[in-house]
């Protein structure tokens, strides 16, 4: 079945936007005015995953780019990366697990937990202009809460 997708932008709970930092990395920083056009637009696809009441499995691709956020082990540590895929085959309903995030939504605040590595979350640093990463702690210094804004297709 064709996968259902929506275009959106994400900001962390400190209102930092996500922008490209080189070809395969995202960073988070405060943007204003016309600079907001730099923020990445995601295509959030609703994919198959494990059944759960409060977790919705999604994949996060970069709109009109054949890049998806994925979670892999690097030096024995769960790591967030942007992975290039064949656009003829993606997005699809049954995404490989490394591409799947469990979207957890409470009061319009979103967390994205790696399906591959439970309790590891898409995270940003308190500091400006730092890479978006996969973090293994919630409620600490690092930020794991995001807000989402829909973008016209």
């Amino acid at each position: 079945a064709p996968v259902r997708s929506l275009n959106c932008t994400l900001r962390d709970s400190q209102q930092k936007s996500l922008v490209m930092s080189g070809p395969y990395e995202l960073k988070a920083l405060h943007l204003q005015g016309q600079d907001m056009e730099q923020q990445v637009v995601f295509s959030m696809s609703f994919v198959q995953g494990e059944e759960s009441n409060d977790k919705i499995p999604v994949a996060l691709g970069l709109k009109e780019k054949n890049l998806y956020l994925s979670c892999v082990l690097k030096d024995d540590k769960p790591t967030l990366q942007l992975e290039s895929v064949d656009p003829k085959n993606y997005p699809k309903k049954k995404m490989e697990k490394r591409f799947v995030f469990n979207k957890i939504e409470i009061n319009n605040k979103l967390e994205f937990e790696s399906a591959q590595f439970p309790n590891w979350y898409i995270s940003t640093s308190q500091a400006e202009n730092m890479p978006v990463f996969l973090g293994g702690t919630k409620g600490g210094q690092d930020i794991t809460d995001f807000t989402m804004q829909f973008v016209s297709s």
């Epitope: 079945a1 064709p2 259902r4 929506l6 275009n7 609703f46 198959q48 059944e51 919705i56 999604v58 309903k93 979207k103 939504e105 319009n108 829909f150 973008v151 016209s152 297709s153």
Partner: antibody, heavy 120, light 107 residues
Framework: QVQLVQSGAEVKKPGASVKVSCKVS????????IEWVRQAPGKGLEWIGE????????NYNEKFKGKATITADTSTDTAYMELSSLRSEDTAVYYC?????????????WGQGTLVTVSS | DIQMTQSPSSLSASVGDRVTITCKAS??????LSWFQQKPGKAPKSLIY???RLVDGVPSRFSGSASGTDYTLTISSLQPEDFATYYC?????????FGQGTKLEIK
């Protein structure tokens, strides 16, 4: 609490158009799809299409492309469905309903329905 | 389009009976299956979504289950207010499609 209030019954002549409204309250309008469903007299339910207000996303049942046009006004939290080139077969009750943007919660809330009668 | 074949089309039962209604999907629908109750002249009322999750306020005598592409609505002990028409809906793939309906009547 969540409410979907639809416009009143309409009687139209064949070939005319009609615009049905669905005013919502009690939730964030832009985060829920508005679904449109029809039910001909004595028949079952048929899905027409959906819109996610504020996102530009609209999906139609191919059967209703060219017949139904779905729009939404985020300033008034109201969705609309316009039916064109009406024929007697379009006589039905038209319902709006809602589903959360991530499709998880089903068609939870429904409007009371709008009866559209096409008769010469 | 995905076909939802609902059975039986009508059913007579008594208060207190256990009743099951089935919908068979023509292909996998990834558990995007809802059940609705409709009474004459009224809008449908949502009972169950994602196969087995009960909508807030719906009595626990209603339950849903799945086996492969077969989906079942069970009413464990019929109450007088349960006599109505029931519909299933798949909302996995466009166009979303409803079953033909099951009219539940008093025996």
């Amino acid at each position: 609490q969540v409410q979907l209030v639809q416009s009143g019954a309409e009687v139209k002549k064949p070939g005319a158009s009609v615009k049905v409204s669905c005013k919502v309250s009690g939730y964030t309008f832009s985060r829920y799809w508005i679904e449109w469903v029809r039910q001909a007299p004595g028949k079952g339910l048929e899905w027409i299409g959906e819109i996610l207000p504020g996102s530009g996303n609209i999906n139609y049942n191919e059967k209703f492309k060219g017949k139904a046009t779905i729009t939404a006004d985020t300033s008034t939290d109201t969705a609309y469905m316009e039916l064109s080139s009406l024929r007697s077969e379009d006589t039905a009750v038209y319902y709006c309903s809602t589903i959360y943007y991530d499709y998880d919660q089903g068609f939870t809330y429904w409007g009371q329905g709008t009866l559209v009668t096409v008769s010469s | 389009d995905i076909q939802m074949t609902q059975s039986p089309s009508s059913l007579s039962a008594s208060v207190g009976d256990r009743v099951t209604i089935t919908c068979k999907a023509s292909q996998d629908i990834d558990r995007y299956l809802s059940w609705f109750q409709q009474k004459p002249g009224k809008a449908p009322k949502s009972l169950i979504y994602r196969v087995k999750r009960l909508v807030d306020g719906v009595p626990s005598r209603f339950s849903g289950s799945a086996s492969g592409t077969d989906y079942t609505l069970t009413i464990s002990s019929l109450q007088p207010e349960d006599f109505a028409t029931y519909y299933c809906l798949q909302y996995d793939e466009f166009p979303y499609t409803f079953g033909q309906g099951t009219k539940l009547e008093i025996k």
